[in-house]
């Protein structure tokens, strides 16, 4: 879904690799399904555009056209540009592909702010740095939009890796992994590496930069350090997870359970922020308020609106607190927490100040339809998506963004007793599945 | 109500270091509402922004000041000063301090200004 | 760098006279933006923040809109101690470090 800040506005210039590699586990080793170890042709298949999204090459049609694909754990619809449009460098067209098959239906996708409209159809699609399979998968091309896409965001298309029962126009419409995994051999799993740029990035850089990997049917143990945490996917819709727990630099912020998840908690890599309930919201940011009170900033850095600059090199991560999230673990009564860094919170703007500052915004912000955790979590770790054992994994991401005295972390197990209890229930309405702002 | 005031030599010779100190009455400098700053006018020019100070010490400076300028806070006397150092001819302006304030973001009290000139 | 052009330069207007200010930054400020008055020989003064809230004491004939990159500073009826020079500032890149360069309304 695209809003405002729905898709990612970081740049991913790998950070630097950690120095130290913890001993795996072998007993986690044993259970990952899929192809272990190296994919090689896969490792830094992302690009992530100075601040607008992280996306893979995919081809589509024969014979094949090469698009940009904007990689999104927030929906379901495999949807590319099939029409002129003005932020588009070239788009699908789908008279010059012989295996293109029309399916005789339309699909309206609207947002809170937005659109895209489109034509149903299949065609023949691979990723050139994926797995050497090529597979009819649906496609909506999009026809007419608004808000959709984004002026030299360099993707041309929104590739939605969750489960059908979000798909547009219904559940019907198989979305494209299910058809990858179905019409091959390949494992139900996929792994996303997203390498956040940690500084500003002038345009060149930006579009040299390399924004990390998503790596399709397995688990690729260069891209993190320590074990991978596993927390169950409480509902294939969404990549819809439990959080118990929430700390800001230790200290707990006393909540019930179900406030963090209230309406759900989902992990979206077409979101940029860290987005939290209105009330979660305002308890976090008084609490790192507290923390960095040695210098104020006003209230619209807050509201993620203004920018606050720092000389460069000196921006003081230190006065910004940690931020864990407790996530139900797979063990009854275990959890473990994933910690990030202000070096993730903090989001690099580039072209606003001098060449001689650092300039960011604060990347957690309000929101009315549940946790999110997008780019902001997900920069920090390297994120399996375990869709064959309905979990997500969590591991310290080898090119996450951090400094000489603390790294992002993953760590457990912990004892949290009734963590079912955290879940909201959604009332069941025939629209509840028709949500598509994500604001 | 609250005033401000600056206080200095007028006269500053080449190469040697401006020094001037605001003092606030009226209220006091270690409010958490507000950051305190330094801006100046060269004569017939616009405004130029040289820095901002909060209570506790944390300071910013202009980029293009860097490296000259120093702005710090003394709670006790409910003052906070600025020293520029090396100046030139072109640092010769109205020095104006002023409490930064609507939420850390405006300019929303003045002092009444100071002429410094520099020359030998 | 943002940077922010006031035009025009100069005004020259009557008493009673409507004065409409131009504020234009090189990139959205969003509504992160400050209008201030400045007669000679004294400090400037707060007239107008946040784009378009006015500051404590200033007359209702002082109003501003704009939002993102075009601003605008109406003096609905050029009263004579309105004859000053008027700038803008942006506040979207904190701490607030740009003015603009100034329009100076004049009696004609």
């Known amino acids: 879904t695209h809003l405002g800040i729905r898709l990612p506005l970081r740049s991913g210039l790998a950070g630097p690799p950690l120095g130290l590699r913890l001993p795996r586990e072998t007993d986690e080793e044993s259970e990952e399904p899929g192809r272990r170890g190296s994919f090689v042709e896969m490792v830094d298949n992302l690009r992530g555009k100075s601040g607008q999204g992280y996306y893979v090459e995919m081809t589509v049609g024969s014979p094949p056209q090469t698009l940009n694909i904007l990689v999104d754990t927030g929906s379901s619809n495999f949807a590319v540009g099939a029409a002129p449009h003005p932020f588009l460098h070239r788009y699908y067209q789908r008279q010059l592909s012989s295996t293109y098959r029309d399916l005789r239906k339309g699909v309206y996708v609207p947002y809170t702010q937005g659109k895209w409209e489109g034509e149903l159809g299949t065609d023949l699609v691979s990723i050139p740095h994926g797995p050497n399979v090529t597979v009819r998968a649906n496609i909506a091309a999009i026809t007419e939009s608004d808000k959709f896409f984004i002026n030299g965001s360099n993707w041309e298309g929104i590739l939605g890796l969750a489960y059908a029962e979000i798909a547009r126009p219904d559940d019907s419409l198989e979305p494209f992994f299910d058809s990858l995994v179905k019409q091959t051999h390949i494992p139900n799993i996929f792994s996303l590496q997203l390498c956040g740029a940690g500084f500003p990035l002038n345009q060149t850089e930006a579009l040299a930069s390399v924004g990390g990997s998503m790596i399709i049917g397995g688990i690729d143990h260069s891209l993190y350090t320590g074990r991978l945490w596993y927390t169950p996917i409480r509902r294939e819709w969404y990549y819809e997870v439990i959080i118990v727990r929430v700390e800001i630099n230790g200290q707990d912020l006393k909540m019930d359970c179900k406030e963090y998840n209230y309406d759900k908690s989902i992990v979206d890599s077409g979101t940029t922020n860290l987005r939290l309930p209105k009330k979660v919201f305002e308890a976090a940011v008084k609490s790192i308020k507290a923390a960095s009170s040695t210098e104020k900033f006003p209230d619209g850095f807050w509201l993620g609106e203004q920018l606050v600059c720092w000389q460069a090199g000196t921006t003081p991560w230190n006065i910004f607190p940690v931020i864990s999230l407790y996530l139900m673990g797979e063990v009854t009564n275990q959890s473990f927490r994933i910690t990030i860094l202000p070096q993730q919170y903090l989001r690099p703007v580039e072209d606003v100040a001098t060449s001689q500052d650092d300039c960011y915004k604060f990347a957690v912000s309000q929101s009315s339809t549940g946790t999110v955790m997008g780019a902001v979590i997900m920069e920090g770790f390297y994120v399996v998506f375990d869709r064959a054992r309905k979990r997500i994994g969590f591991a310290v991401s080898a090119c996450h963004v951090h400094d000489e005295f603390r790294t992002a972390a993953v760590e457990g197990p912990f004892v949290t007793a009734d963590m079912e209890d955290c879940g909201y229930n959604i009332p069941q309405t025939d629209e509840s599945t028709l949500m598509t702002g994500r604001a | 109500q609250l005033q401000l005031q600056e206080s200095g030599p007028g006269l500053v010779k080449p190469s040697e270091t401006l020094s001037l100190t605001c003092t606030v009455s009226g209220g006091p400098i270690s409010s958490s509402s507000y950051y305190w700053g330094w801006i100046r006018q060269p004569p017939g020019k616009g405004l130029e922004w040289i820095g901002n100070?909060?209570?506790?010490?944390?300071?910013y400076y202009n980029p293009s000041l860097r490296g000259r300028v120093t702005i710090s806070v003394d709670t006790s006397k409910n003052q906070f000063s600025l020293k520029l150092s090396s100046v030139t001819a072109a640092d010769t302006a109205v020095y104006y301090c002023?409490?930064?304030?609507?939420?850390?973001?405006?300019?929303?009290?003045w002092g009444r200004g100071t002429l410094v000139t520099v020359s030998s | 760098e943002i940077v922010l052009t006031q035009s025009p330069a100069t005004l020259s207007l009557s008493p009673g006279e409507r004065a409409t200010l131009s504020c234009r930054a090189s990139q959205s400020v969003s509504s992160y933006l400050a209008w201030f008055q400045q007669k000679p020989g004294q400090a400037p003064r707060l007239l107008i923040y946040?784009?378009?809230n006015r500051a404590t004491g200033i007359p209702a004939r002082f109003s501003g809109s704009g939002s993102g990159t075009d601003f605008t500073l109406t003096i609905s009826s050029l009263e004579p101690e309105d004859f000053a020079v008027y700038y803008c500032?942006?506040?979207?890149?904190?701490?607030?470090?740009?003015f603009g360069g100034g329009t100076k309304v004049e009696i004609k």
């Open positions: 500032q942006q506040v979207y890149v904190w701490p607030p470090r740009t």
């Open positions: 100070i909060y209570y506790s010490g944390s300071t």
């Open positions: 946040d784009a378009s």
């Open positions: 002023a409490r930064l304030g609507h939420g850390y973001n405006y300019f929303d009290l």
